[in-house]
């Protein structure tokens, strides 16, 4: 019988008492085969973290700063359940740390030196740790003691709780630096008042502070937010303009064997019986003998943290950067305007080899990072382990939902000013063998299908979106008799046709021979009835253009396209017989790397792009013998996006809507994790 006990860690006598009450009340409402609580008392949160890591306890609720400590080796804990605030309909699990300024003040984030600053309090998250952590490498040296460096950075400050004797500049705007509400500039509202009164130029608070202090929109319109990309935005656009997104209070557990499902089962049942307004005798979110015991008194309930989410992803790149800077205190030798090497994310060993060759030819401009799947790469770019990669539109959507931005688009048509003219897109098509003359778009049920990969545009999102509209369910593996859709569950019929050996079977990378455009077409040639690819795939792999044994004798005339009206057309008539127009593949990166990725890639394509005529003797960025490694092989150049610089603008309303509709069928664990951070 599996042990269904969750050992909760308590950090004080009062918490231990509440924990025992929690345990007893849960016993009274949960059947004997359900989850139960045991209480473990430790002297501090750090002791609780260590106890969980050592398997002496299972769970504890932590503030964001401690979630970071819990994640660090050797603890390796992960977030499993989040407290939420507000309503069940609009649950808030995060708050945003923001920098508020007056509208007419005219400076940006990178111009804060010499300004006057208002802080909620020394050592507090939104008011100190996050802004000072992010500004850390701009502070004058020596950076220790930190208070002295901050005092020398700003021309005056109010940082309540600072030592006014040692660091008078930190108390210049609020004499005495009182550490309670007796100081009119203490806390969130106090820091905002410090700005409002004209004492300071910038206030470091949380996103709700301005709404709580100014009910009137006209008053709020006198203020703006400073964004990390050195722009400003209105105060209600805090989701797109903040210093960090911070989880409020989170239950953590071991990453391996951490009982996360059991902890959720326990807390979900606990909130049903003892949540807000549920029971008089025991209340989960109330602390009669103290404040915020076990859980925050202001919490309204719990939400399960998606399993794909580790602490780095949960805390977010900005928060982790800020806290790491403060803790480790390391900065580059001397900040320069030089761009650091771009860390390109390569999928599996084929792409890694091409990336390594690019890296040595780039003379230090490109470094390589490997991952096994596109989603793993996106996650690495999110957390700073990698910087950029080129993605199919379906993954541009996921990357966008995860906070990444498109920076350059692949262009596939030769033109005079290729780099200045991003194209409208390519065509997603359904290809069949000419010999299967009875096959049409209307009778695909029970046939064998070949897809580039799950989540990709031409191979999945477009055809499956159209199919979903017809069949109104997500069981595509029942619609087709079998197929190869790399990235499907291994036991699915949509992995049955795949050719990868062993663990590589149906993997969404080049170790699976039927992966990607060329792979899906090969699947059709060798085993399938229909392949969902791009309009250039057939000509690129027939007529001797692909020298591989399976392709060298193929003839374009032996294949036809399925049109949505139930007819068929020759392959060259794709403009009048396609499933939809697909946005071109695009390079994505984090917002903070956008300028450098843009600059370095434009240099790289001038050196190694399609102007290189002899790819047998020189490195060519856009060539890999039909394997589409790092970039599509038919890329002519990487083009500027002009104003299409967000994922929504880049992909276009129609495509975003189509993928959004297909979201209910999504098996993307990364998309689930990212929409948890930003619903």
């Amino acid at each position: 019988v599996p042990d269904k006990t969750v050992r909760w860690c308590a950090v004080s006598e009062h918490e231990a008492t509440k924990c025992q009450s929690f345990r007893d009340h849960m016993k009274s409402v949960i059947p004997s085969d359900g989850p139960s609580v045991a209480c473990v008392k430790k002297a501090s949160y750090l002791d609780c973290i260590r106890a969980i890591a050592a398997n002496e306890a299972d769970a504890v609720t932590l503030d964001a700063g401690l979630v970071y400590d819990a994640y660090l080796a050797p603890n390796n804990l992960k977030p499993v359940v989040a407290e939420f605030y507000g309503s069940k309909e609009d649950p808030q699990t995060f708050y945003y740390a923001v920098a508020v300024v007056k509208k007419d003040s005219g400076f940006q984030m990178n111009q804060l030196r010499g300004k006057k600053s208002c802080h909620t309090g020394l050592g507090r998250s939104a008011g100190w740790n996050i802004p000072i952590g992010l500004l850390y490498c701009d502070l004058p040296e020596p950076r220790k003691p930190l208070e002295k460096a901050v005092a020398n950075f700003f021309s005056g400050s109010c940082a309540p709780c600072a030592d006014g004797t040692d660091f008078p500049q930190l108390c210049q705007l609020c004499p005495g630096c009182g550490c309670s509400t007796l100081n009119q500039y203490f806390g969130y509202s106090g820091a905002f008042k410090c700005l409002k009164d004209g004492a300071g130029d910038v206030a470091f608070v949380k996103h709700s502070t301005i709404f709580e202090n100014l009910a009137n929109k006209a008053d709020r319109d006198q203020y703006e937010l400073l964004c990390l990309d050195n722009t400003r935005k209105p105060v209600d656009e805090y989701k797109d303009c903040h210093l960090a997104q911070v989880p409020s209070h989170t239950v953590v557990a071991r990453s391996m064997g951490g009982k996360e499902d059991l902890i959720w089962e326990l807390l979900n049942q606990a909130q049903e019986h003892f949540g807000k307004d549920k029971s008089k005798e025991f209340q989960l979110f109330s602390s009669p003998h103290g404040k915020d015991l076990l859980f925050k008194d202001s919490a309204h309930g719990f939400l399960k943290v998606p399993p794909r989410m580790d602490a780095k992803m949960y805390l977010g790149y900005e928060y982790v950067t800020a806290i790491r800077n403060l803790r480790e205190g390391t900065c580059p030798e001397a900040p320069t305007d030089e761009c650091k090497p771009v860390k390109w994310c390569a999928l599996s060993h084929h792409e890694r080899l091409k990336c390594d060759e690019w890296s040595v030819n780039s003379v230090g401009k490109i470094e390589c990072v490997s991952a096994e799947t596109t989603e793993d790469c996106i996650a690495k770019i999110m957390n700073g382990e990698a910087d950029a990669m080129s993605l199919d539109g379906g993954f541009v959507y996921i990357a966008g939902k995860c906070g990444l931005v498109p920076v350059l688009a692949e262009n596939y048509n030769k033109s005079d000013n290729c780099e200045d003219t991003p194209e409208a897109g390519y065509f997603a098509i359904a290809v069949v063998k000419k010999s299967a003359s009875d096959l049409t778009w209307d009778n695909l049920k029970g046939k064998k299908s070949c897809h580039t990969a799950v989540g990709r545009t031409a191979g999945w999102n477009i055809p499956m979106g159209l199919l979903y509209n017809k069949i109104n369910h997500c069981r595509f593996d029942e619609f087709f008799s079998e197929g190869c859709a790399p990235g499907s569950k291994k036991d699915s019929s949509l992995c049955k046709l795949c050719m990868g050996s062993g663990l590589n079977l149906c993997e969404p990378n080049n170790k699976e021979g039927y992966y990607g455009y060329t792979g899906a077409f090969r699947c059709l040639v060798e085993k399938g009835d229909v392949a969902f690819v791009k309009h250039q795939t057939v000509p690129q792999n027939t007529g001797g253009k692909n020298p591989d044994p399976w392709a060298k004798n193929l003839n374009e005339k032996d294949y036809e396209l399925l049109c949505l009206d139930g007819t068929r057309k020759p392959v060259e008539e794709y403009a009048n017989c396609h499933l939809a127009r697909a946005p071109n593949h695009a390079v994505v990166t984090r917002k903070d790397k956008e300028a450098c990725v843009h600059k370095i890639l434009r240099q790289q394509q001038h050196l190694f792009g399609s102007n290189v005529t002899d790819c047998s003797g020189n490195f060519c960025l856009f060539r890999s013998e039909t394997k589409d490694l790092l970039f599509r092989d038919d890329t002519v150049c990487l083009a500027k996006l002009h104003d299409r610089n967000t994922y929504e603008k880049y992909l276009g309303e129609e495509y975003v809507k189509a993928v959004g509709n297909l979201r209910k069928c999504s098996t993307s664990s990364l998309l689930e994790a990212c929409t948890f951070r930003r619903p």
């Epitope: 084929h350 080899l353 091409k354 040595v360 047998s616 003797g617 020189n618």
Partner: nanobody, 117 residues
Framework: QVQLVESGGGLVQPGGSLRLSCVAS????????MGWYRQAPGKQRELVAA???????KYTDSVKGRFTISRDNAKNTVYLQMNSLKPEDTAVYYC???????????WGQGTQVTVSS
């Protein structure tokens, strides 16, 4: 088809040196970048060093300052001089011609390097 033949491996004590050679034969006039990779038991194959036809080089962090890659275009040969060897350098070392390897999974047979006292 390019043939790559590696040699020069062997058993050496920590702190010792070895020089690996890789000779390319076949249609080698067009080889641009050459690289040395290594694979230890149970580990992924990893880049050790690479060199372009013009002599640009790249090294993995763990071998910087100890290993030197060079090439002799006239002899169609790439070398890896390995000094101050450590036990963690133990692996099979492969040389690769990038212009083919990433499409055709083509590798030579490799040469075993063992660093042990």
């Amino acid at each position: 088809q390019v043939q790559l033949v590696e040699s020069g491996g062997g058993l050496v004590q920590p702190g010792g040196s070895l020089r690996l050679s890789c000779v390319a034969s076949g249609s080698i006039f067009s080889i641009n970048t050459m690289g040395w990779y290594r694979q230890a038991p149970g580990k992924q194959r990893e880049l050790v060093a690479a060199i372009t036809r013009g002599g640009n080089t790249k090294y993995t962090d763990s071998v910087k300052g100890r290993f030197t890659i060079s090439r002799d275009n006239a002899k169609n040969t790439v070398y890896l001089q390995m000094n101050s060897l450590k036990p963690e350098d133990t692996a099979v070392y492969y040389c690769t011609d990038y212009s083919r390897s990433y499409y055709q999974d083509y590798w030579g047979q490799g040469t075993q390097v063992t660093v042990s006292s």
